[in-house]
Interface confidence: low
């Protein structure tokens, strides 16, 4: 399984403007992440952004903007001034270097036949955005939650109206579950059109962050913004998954080999689970 | 332990190729990209090639670019350098390295490129 | 590329004295700086990761500083065995680059 995700979005309202999202998923500190395009970066890619945890970012045109999105992912805005895109066939790489235990590069692309108008994929692939996952999942919940409680309403009038306790849901939370098809599912990462069952489960779902600010007791913690949740979320566009490999600046005093990713999840809505990080010293 | 240990360096000369190898034992040689680094007589140390766990990416200065060739053998636990087209300026002990930054070092192969 | 520049080829401590190297980058490297002691006869050992970090097994007198494009190694209590060439490395851009070395002497 790959240590980095790689998923390129094209915005439903603004056919010229692109997202770039790129997440770690090995245990260890985030040192450093860079996204590139048109390669890797030193490899014919030019940079797009450098984000570091502590010195913050920098972003090169054109790059709009530049943000973490988690602990463990990134988010670049990229704005094409031009009239035909030139990010449609554009390859985008992101870097997260972990030192020194080590660095992972994976690319990704925008599909030529994504059409940003689509208010669902054709056909499922593992895209599903924190925020919406959220705002869906807990519409979903409220709006069964208060069918119900009318229809009690309305058949028993006489009884007393069962309270509806509210489910504990932080963002973190959402957006462990709502990734889950792009970190853990190795149908989606060899076959983008796997059919993802992506169960949202407020309730009983808790959260991982298996490559957490803390296993290196030396960084200072970084404290991530959050997904954002705005109304104006556009409806995604198709989206790719290209995996390329680990180890691409491999740096020393990495920890143990992986076996896997450090992110475990589970169907049966007991959410993901951490996976103990195996870390040397990076 | 880690260990990592170079052999194929020798005498050559100018327009000459030679192929260095680097024996990899003591972790998971597949999981971790691995490096050449060459130390010029008067010491000054240059990083001259770098490649990914799987050998997908490879990476090069300028100063060898066309040159120099990285790859690995990962069922060999075997890093490998081709060089070509060697001059006299490449005369140099080659490290291989784990990592970036180098954490564990071979102790070198020296090459002479004379005529 | 990202010049790495060590200006003082020699520097001179007794033992147990504090010694500090400098090294410069050409342009701003954030933190990705690493520091390197070779001994003579031996290849080199990574001694500073990510300007401040030290790497497994190193003695916490050598401490590292720095950011942007100004970096230090300091050795506090020099002992004989540190008796080496000191060099910095930038880990923030391809191609890696290397400074020219400091030899620490020991009086």
């Known amino acids: 399984t790959p240590e980095v995700w790689v998923q390129v979005q094209m915005e439903a309202t603004e056919l010229s403007s692109f997202t770039v999202h790129c997440g770690f998923l090995g245990p260890g500190s985030i040192s450093l992440v860079t996204v590139s395009w048109g390669g890797p970066d030193g490899a014919g890619g030019t940079k797009l952004a450098v984000l570091h945890p502590e010195l913050g970012t920098r972003q090169w045109a054109p790059a709009r903007q530049a943000r973490w999105e988690t602990q463990s992912s990134i988010s670049l805005a990229l704005e094409d001034s031009g009239a035909s895109s030139p990010f449609a066939n554009t390859t985008f790489c992101c870097k997260f270097a972990s030192f020194p235990e080590g660095s992972w590069e994976s690319c990704g692309s925008l599909p030529p036949s994504s059409d940003p108008g689509l208010s669902a994929p054709p056909t499922p692939v593992p895209i599903l955005r924190a925020d919406l996952a959220g705002i869906l999942g807990l519409s979903g919940v409220l709006l069964f939650g208060c069918g119900y409680l009318l229809h009690l309403l309305r058949r028993q009038k006489h009884r007393p109206t069962p309270r509806l306790q509210p489910s504990h849901t932080n963002s973190q939370a959402l957006t462990a579950q709502a990734w889950a098809p792009s970190q853990a599912s190795q149908a989606a990462l060899h076959d983008p059109y796997a059919t993802i069952n992506t169960s949202f489960c407020p309730a009983t779902l808790d959260t991982a962050h298996p490559n957490g600010w803390a296993s290196l007791p030396t960084h200072a913690a970084h404290q991530p913004q959050g997904p954002a949740a705005s109304a104006s979320t556009p409806i995604l566009a198709r989206g790719s998954f290209v995996s390329v490999e680990n180890g691409l600046y491999t740096q020393a005093g990495e920890r143990p080999p992986h076996t896997g990713p450090g992110l475990t999840l589970f169907p049966d809505c007991r959410g993901p689970r951490a996976v103990e990080g195996r870390f040397g010293v990076r | 332990e880690v260990q990592l240990q170079e052999s194929g360096g020798g005498s050559v000369k100018p327009g000459g190729s030679l192929q260095l190898s680097c024996a990899a034992s003591g972790f998971t040689f597949s999981s971790y990209g691995m490096s050449w680094i060459r130390q010029s007589p008067e010491k000054k140390l240059e990083w001259v090639a770098e490649i990914s766990s799987g050998g997908t990416y490879t990476y090069y200065p300028d100063t060898v670019t066309g040159r120099f060739t990285i790859s690995r053998d990962n069922a060999k636990n075997t890093l490998y350098l081709e060089m070509s087209s060697l001059r006299s300026e490449d005369t140099a002990m080659y490290y291989c390295?784990?990592?970036?930054?180098?954490?564990?070092w071979g102790q070198g192969t020296l090459v002479t490129v004379s005529a | 590329d990202v010049v790495m520049t060590q200006s003082h080829k020699f520097v001179s401590t007794s033992v147990g004295g504090r010694v500090s190297i400098t090294c410069k980058a050409s342009?701003?490297?954030?933190?990705?700086v690493a520091w390197y002691q070779q001994k003579p006869g031996q290849s080199p050992k990574l001694l500073i990761y990510?300007?401040?970090y030290r790497f497994t097994g190193v003695p916490d007198r050598f401490t590292g500083s720095g950011s942007g494009t100004d970096f230090t190694l300091t050795i506090n209590g020099v002992q004989a065995e540190d008796l080496a060439v000191y060099s910095c490395?930038?880990?923030?851009?391809?191609?890696?680059?290397f400074g020219g070395g400091t030899k620490l002497e020991i009086k």
């Open positions: 342009q701003d490297v954030m933190t990705a």
């Open positions: 390295a784990r990592g970036d930054p180098f954490g564990y």
């Open positions: 990510s300007t401040s």
């Open positions: 490395q930038q880990h923030y851009s391809t191609p890696r680059t």
